[in-house]
Interface confidence: medium
């Protein structure tokens, strides 16, 4: 059990020509707010895919109204953390999506309107009980800041919240802050929130918010001394000399991201991720021009027109961001046909077709027809995951089995007589018609009103019917 | 499978109380809203109260504000309605619903039908002059 949170520490419009002045519409003021989505695993899942992990809202920021005079601002944010409680094992790789919604204040006939402004999607690997990671994303226009951590609750201890820690009640040597490393312990790294004041070196705690004095402590807050002291977890190496865990750095201490950037914990080490015009593993490298190559994934480099920005990066197709490092969420074009749902996998793009649907875009009707043969001569027509049969002449049903009486619709006008043949009907038509349906009179002259009839062919004689 | 079930509903005389309660079984609904609508005889279904898992956002009717209160118990999954000071004009059959914006929404409305996709089967209020 443990909880994810998220801080959101800026949200307003990223660097450059281009970015809004304001969250707002034209309809006048609004409020923003934010919702977080966990998923487990680093897949690309489909946006539609349930919050596995967990999601949560923060509370409304405050009314803004936009200055037309004044600099855009950072928005006011609301207030305080958006935390996700988990019950289960923490999985350690997750996907993080963070909505930025705003609330338009203008006049709504039934009730407010919310409107999507940004979206951000972070694959990351996140050990539980580890210090924040920082993060800046570009969701078009706008730039988010943000950190986040998972902690675990209650007794669960661990990178994945799954062991139970049973503090020890027996005093030891340890100094403040530090905690004994007995046997089958050493997964204890994070005690529960203990009540408030409760003392770091006496009191512990196995459930948040109260306070149990270690032998020869005593008080509400287990201040009043009265024998040796023990103490409790903090995470890190273990301390040869005293056999207790003493506090380790993690890789973002500090911040080793310079020139403003933000760092963000991965497995072993760190990632930094720079402001405009820094590059480099820690955002050392400044003053970047096209001959630094600061463009990513093929981006064509163009130099800038001004100081402030000294270079422009035209993204191939599935990037963006400043120097093209973002791939495009390519399943926003919609490139699935035929209601084919879209999963984009970072290499490709998949679509998973509907029923009767097949193609790299679901873009080909399946042929319905195979393996369902027409008789009869029959020819089958695809369509709509369904197969039909357009049936030969003297065949009907479903599939041109059942036999049809082709005279049965007295096709041979004017008094003709019809006799069924193999390969339909022919009219014996009565003096004075002709025609494979007796439908043209004879003149009296001995002249159709037709063109010559074909050769061996007399006016009164049986038309046969192709 | 999701379901929804209200209780609470009767009928009070104008100016009284009722607490109207909907219970969630088979769905979670952390970061997404459940709420009270309302339809009246021979008219559409209308919001009355929503509210978001933490408790954080509500939003009310312009018609109930000030005498309608809506919380939940998150560990009952559960949403109450407190109605004070009933008016015939809120007779009607009460229904609970539960949702919220998707992942793909680009515009969602918190007092109007279509943004909810769970619904309960409804209480009826009666309130006589």
């Known amino acids: 059990a443990g909880v994810f949170e998220l801080q959101i520490h800026s949200f307003g419009p990223g660097p450059g020509p281009g970015a809004p002045r304001s969250p707002c519409s034209a309809r006048g003021p609004c409020r923003l707010f934010f919702r977080v989505c966990l998923k487990p695993g680093l897949s690309e899942e489909a946006a539609e895919s349930p919050c596995a992990l967990g999601a949560a809202l923060s509370a409304r920021g405050p009314v803004y109204t936009e200055q037309p005079e004044a600099p855009a601002p950072d928005l006011p944010l609301p207030n305080g953390l958006l935390q996700v409680p988990f019950r289960d094992a923490w999985p350690g790789t997750f996907s993080l999506i963070i909505e930025t919604w705003r609330e338009e204040l203008g006049d709504q006939i039934g009730g407010p309107a919310w409107s999507l402004l940004a979206r951000v999607t972070r694959r990351r690997r996140l050990a539980a009980g580890g210090p924040w990671a920082r993060d800046i994303q570009r969701a078009g226009a706008w730039e988010l800041r943000f950190s986040y951590r998972a902690r675990c609750e209650l007794l669960a201890v661990g990178t994945a919240c799954t062991r139970l820690c049973r503090p020890r009640s027996a005093p030891s040597r340890c100094g403040p802050g530090l905690r004994p490393c007995a046997p089958l312990e050493d997964e204890c790294e994070a005690p529960p929130v203990c009540r408030a004041g409760c003392s770091l070196e006496h009191g512990f705690c196995e459930q948040p918010g109260e306070c149990r004095c270690l032998e020869g402590w005593t008080g509400p807050l287990c201040t009043v001394p009265a024998s040796t002291s023990s103490c409790l977890g903090l995470r890190g190496p273990s301390s040869a000399t005293t056999g207790c865990l003493v506090p380790g750095p993690g890789p973002c201490d500090g911040n080793p991201c310079a020139n403003g950037g933000s760092c963000s914990e991965t497995p072993g080490s760190f990632e930094c991720t720079c402001p405009r015009g820094f590059y480099g593993l820690r955002c050392e490298v400044s003053g970047v021009t096209c001959a630094d190559g600061p463009c990513f994934n093929g981006g064509l480099c163009v130099g800038g027109a001004d100081p402030d920005s000294a270079y422009i990066c035209h993204c191939p197709p599935g990037f963006q961001g400043s120097n093209c490092e973002k791939r495009v969420d390519r399943c926003s074009l919609q490139p699935c046909r035929n209601g084919g749902l879209c999963l984009d996998l970072g290499h490709a793009l998949r679509c998973r077709c509907r029923a009767g649907f097949a193609g790299p875009r679901c873009e080909h009707n399946l042929d319905d027809c195979a393996g369902r043969a027409c008789a009869n001569g029959g020819t089958c027509v695809e369509g709509g995951g369904a197969h039909r049969c357009s049936c030969a002449l003297g065949f009907g049903g479903r599939d041109c089995r059942e036999r049809a009486d082709p005279c049965a619709a007295r096709p041979c006008a004017h008094g003709g007589r019809c006799y069924a043949h193999f390969s339909g009907l022919v009219c014996a038509c009565a003096p004075g018609y002709m025609g494979s349906r007796c439908e043209f009179p004879v003149h009296p002259d001995g002249v159709s009103a037709l063109p010559a009839a074909p050769p061996g062919l007399r006016p009164g004689d049986p038309q046969r019917y192709l | 499978e999701v379901q929804l079930a209200e209780s609470g509903g009767g009928s009070v005389q104008a100016g009284g109380s009722l607490r109207l309660s909907c219970a969630a079984s088979g769905y979670t609904y952390r970061s997404n809203f459940m709420g009270w609508f309302r339809q009246a005889p021979a008219k559409e279904r209308e919001g009355v109260a929503t509210?978001?898992?933490?408790?954080?956002?509500?939003y009310y009717a312009d018609s109930v504000k000030g005498r309608f209160t809506i919380s939940q118990d998150n560990e009952k999954n559960t949403v109450y309605l407190q109605m004070n000071s009933l008016k015939p004009e809120d007779t009607a059959m009460y229904y609970c619903?539960?949702?919220?914006?998707?992942?793909?929404?680009?515009?969602?409305?918190?007092?109007?039908?279509?943004?909810?996709?769970?619904w309960g089967q409804g209480t009826q209020v009666t309130v006589s002059s």
């Open positions: 619903a539960a949702g919220g914006p998707r992942t793909n929404d680009d515009r969602w409305y918190p007092l109007r039908p279509p943004g909810y996709n769970y």
């Open positions: 509210i978001d898992s933490r408790g954080t956002i509500t």
